[in-house]
């Protein structure tokens, strides 16, 4: 496992859920779907009901107000997106409730949410040079950038 950054020594405090039941699309118009229990993948789907619906929870950070630390949960579940290492799939891990405070190794559950226009980026707090990323016909993983796709569109209020 790659060493944690200095940010992992910080403590993050849960504020509230800031987005409910949204879908993530990448720039190839692939949608994030849940595959094989604890994994996510990106696929071009005909039926949006196959898309994962996420909730986003915000945490406090005393470091940088331009970067919002968030946790990503599959709606109506106790499954949270957890970062591994570079080029490793992100995992869905079960927790009984949303963590009130996060520190140390638990920063695997946190991502800095950055927006640039309609583009959304999720940077691992545990690995600040790595983004949530998709690759064609492959797992959602952590990557530095191309050839993986790291920018997402957030689709809200999908029926």
């Amino acid at each position: 496992s790659a060493p944690f950054s200095f940010l992992s020594n910080m403590t993050y405090h849960f504020i509230r859920i800031i987005k409910h039941e949204f879908i993530l699309n990448d720039t190839l118009n692939q949608t994030i779907i849940r595959a094989n229990d604890q994994y996510l993948t990106a696929a071009a789907i005909h039926n949006l009901d196959e898309a994962v619906k996420f909730d986003m929870g915000a945490y406090t950070s005393s470091k940088d107000d331009t970067k919002v630390p968030v946790i990503l949960r599959i709606s109506k579940t106790q499954l949270y997106v957890s970062a591994q290492d570079e080029d490793q799939p992100v995992l869905l891990k079960e927790m009984p409730e949303i963590p009130k405070t996060i520190t140390g190794s638990e920063t695997n559950f946190l991502f800095f949410w950055e927006t640039h226009g309609t583009k959304n980026y999720f940077i691992s707090v545990a690995h600040p040079n790595l983004f949530i990323a998709t690759k064609h016909d492959n797992w959602v993983c952590l990557a530095k950038g191309l050839p993986s796709i790291t920018d997402f569109q957030i689709l809200e209020n999908q029926a």
Epitope: R34, N36, T41, E50, A51, V52
Partner: antibody, heavy 122, light 107 residues
Framework: EIQLVQSGAEVKKPGASVKVSCKAS????????MNWVRQAPGQGLEWMGW????????TYADDFKGRFTFTLDTSTSTAYMELSSLRSEDTAVYYC???????????????WGQGTTVTVSS | DIQMTQSPSSLSASVGDRVTITCRAS??????LNWYQQKPGKTPKLLIY???RLRSGVPSRFSGSGSGTDYTFTISSLQPEDIATYFC?????????FGQGTKLEIK
């Protein structure tokens, strides 16, 4: 076109073993779990368990722990269900079924094999 | 484990009738309820997922509703080709249990 094609009917004696195959096509095999469902003659559907087609890890329902084994051959996109120490009450149709998550939370079985009849008789 | 109790176990209705089948879960399943149709001698087929979403190609006379622990499957106007056994299945957590089934016959 998504298809699950199962092996043919089997007639076995008590105490023997049987291995049923389920060959998948038309989708990325590793992206969808494979479920096994039993239907005894004139009875309902029983979820036996499923195998993660990426990791190979299996989950079994309580009634199907011990004598049942799920395996994979990822090179041919084939899932297998093996049943050992056969008994007369194992006589049933065994189905494989692809698992899908709707909204990332609701698990359903959207494509099914044609079923394999296993008859256990002395 | 989540138990699914389906009723009735069998029912007889006439062509054009409205038919209703119920399914009760032993705990809240948050609308994660699916319905399957199995025609005699055939493989099961997913009709409805997530309580009320019709799978592509499924006729609109089929519908589903409910919440919490209680769910309903309805055929608004029974057709001869609807003769089958119908099963509910909870999709919230493994083991993904089925109801006992409802055998539907034409009067």
């Amino acid at each position: 076109e998504i298809q699950l094609v199962q092996s043919g009917a089997e007639v076995k004696k008590p105490g023997a073993s049987v291995k049923v195959s389920c060959k998948a096509s038309g989708y990325t095999f590793a992206h969808y779990g494979m479920n096994w469902v039993r239907q005894a003659p004139g009875q309902g559907l029983e979820w036996m368990g499923w195998i993660n087609t990426y990791t190979g890890q299996s989950t079994y329902a309580d009634d199907f722990k011990g004598r049942f084994t799920f395996t994979l051959d990822t090179s041919t996109s084939t899932a297998y269900m093996e049943l050992s120490s056969l008994r007369s009450e194992d006589t049933a149709v065994y189905y494989c079924a692809r698992g899908i998550y709707y909204f990332g939370s609701n698990y359903a079985m959207d494509y099914w094999g044609q079923g394999t009849t296993v008859t256990v008789s002395s | 484990d989540i138990q699914m109790t389906q009723s009735p176990s069998s029912l007889s209705a006439s062509v054009g009738d409205r038919v209703t089948i119920t399914c009760r879960a032993s705990q809240d399943i948050s609308n994660m309820l699916n319905w399957y149709q199995q025609k005699p001698g055939k493989t099961p087929k997913l009709l409805i997922y997530y309580t009320s979403r019709l799978r592509s190609g499924v006729p609109s006379r089929f519908s589903g509703s409910g919440s919490g622990t209680d769910y309903t499957f309805t055929i608004s106007s029974l057709q001869p080709e609807d003769i089958a056994t119908y099963f509910c299945q909870q999709g919230k957590k493994p083991p993904y249990t089925f109801g006992q089934g409802t055998k539907l016959e034409i009067k």
